[in-house]
Interface confidence: low
């Protein structure tokens, strides 16, 4: 599995952002496909669960991302993206996208560095 993400992303506090993760695989996409999103805060705190997909999407039931993350992927089109709503400054950090599609071997985990800013273009 090969994972493709944009290296960095900046978004304005209070807005919604699409965390794009696409992938390629020699194996056809089927019911064995799983997608896991995690978050590493900028301050170096523990990694946190964001989202899991296996046949159906599973959103976090508690924690910082409860009711703020939704599936926006399309496995048949090799898309494992999610939407994150109502950005907060403490959403700053690294989001990882891991796709497993047996029998294909696991690939490198995709990373997106998200910077939440007051206004885009550094006008803070």
């Amino acid at each position: 599995v090969e994972i493709y993400t944009s290296r960095v992303l900046e978004a304005v506090n209070g807005t919604d952002v699409r965390l794009k993760c696409t992938f390629s695989s020699f194996a056809p996409v089927g019911d064995a496909l799983t997608v896991t999103w995690n978050f590493r805060p900028l301050d170096g705190g523990p990694e946190q669960f964001v989202f899991y997909y296996h046949i159906d999407p599973f959103r976090p039931m508690s924690g910082r991302f409860k009711d703020r993350v939704v599936w926006d992927g399309n496995p048949e089109r090799y898309d494992a993206s999610i939407l994150l709503w109502k950005l907060q400054f403490d959403d700053n950090g690294t989001y990882t996208c891991q796709v497993k599609n047996p029998p294909d071997v696991d690939g490198v985990i995709g990373e997106i560095r998200l910077s939440v800013v007051h206004t885009v273009r550094f006008s803070e």
């Epitope: 090969e2 944009s6 900046e10 390629s24 900028l42 803070e124």
Partner: antibody
Framework: QVQLQQPGAELVKPGASVKLSCKAS?????NYWMHWVKLRPGQGFEW???????????DYNEKFKRKATLTVDKSSSTAYMQLSSLTSEDSAVYYC?????????WGQGTTLTVSS | QIVLTQSPALMSASPGERVTLTCSAS?????MYWYQQKPGSSPKPWIY???NLASGVPARFSGSGSGTSYSLTISSMEAEDAATYYC?????????FGAGTKLELK
Amino acid sequence: QVQLQQPGAELVKPGASVKLSCKASGYTFTNYWMHWVKLRPGQGFEWIGEINPTNGGTDYNEKFKRKATLTVDKSSSTAYMQLSSLTSEDSAVYYCTIYTTALDYWGQGTTLTVSS
Amino acid sequence: QIVLTQSPALMSASPGERVTLTCSASSSVGYMYWYQQKPGSSPKPWIYVTSNLASGVPARFSGSGSGTSYSLTISSMEAEDAATYYCQQWSSNPPTFGAGTKLELK
């Protein structure tokens, strides 16, 4: 506006160490990873590594792990890169840079000359 | 690490000519970034995420590609386009750059 200020040049002797600085202004220093890139004439750019200004966490290119040490001083919004055991191979222009989605900001670069 | 090979290394183009610079990756990458650098200046971001023009870049520039093959195209060469262009990938650590294509005005 965003500025990354670097000294223009450094001259050091082989075997010595040098600490290059990059003073950031015009944005929130802790919001963006600071990267360092090496440019040798005729050899292209090499990514050295990056540092998270919030907690000092680093990620290095394996090639530079024993050569470069990245640090920051949040109080002065300054990033540093220390290069050790210098040889002529380390003579190059060193840039600090921050990456955003659509725009990168680069310092003017410090020309490091290693010569006896 | 992923090796990016740019071709040609040196190219001359006349004003108004269509120019295509290529960047080939040793293995598949998700996106490509391009920089323009002129002597004595820092690199300028030129094209990001394969096909998006950075702020201030003229519309005569375009980027395209996928997998291991990417390109930067100038639809009509102008004198100010003479510079060295570098490609960069960020799909795999460490990020790597091509050796550059020096574009000269004929």
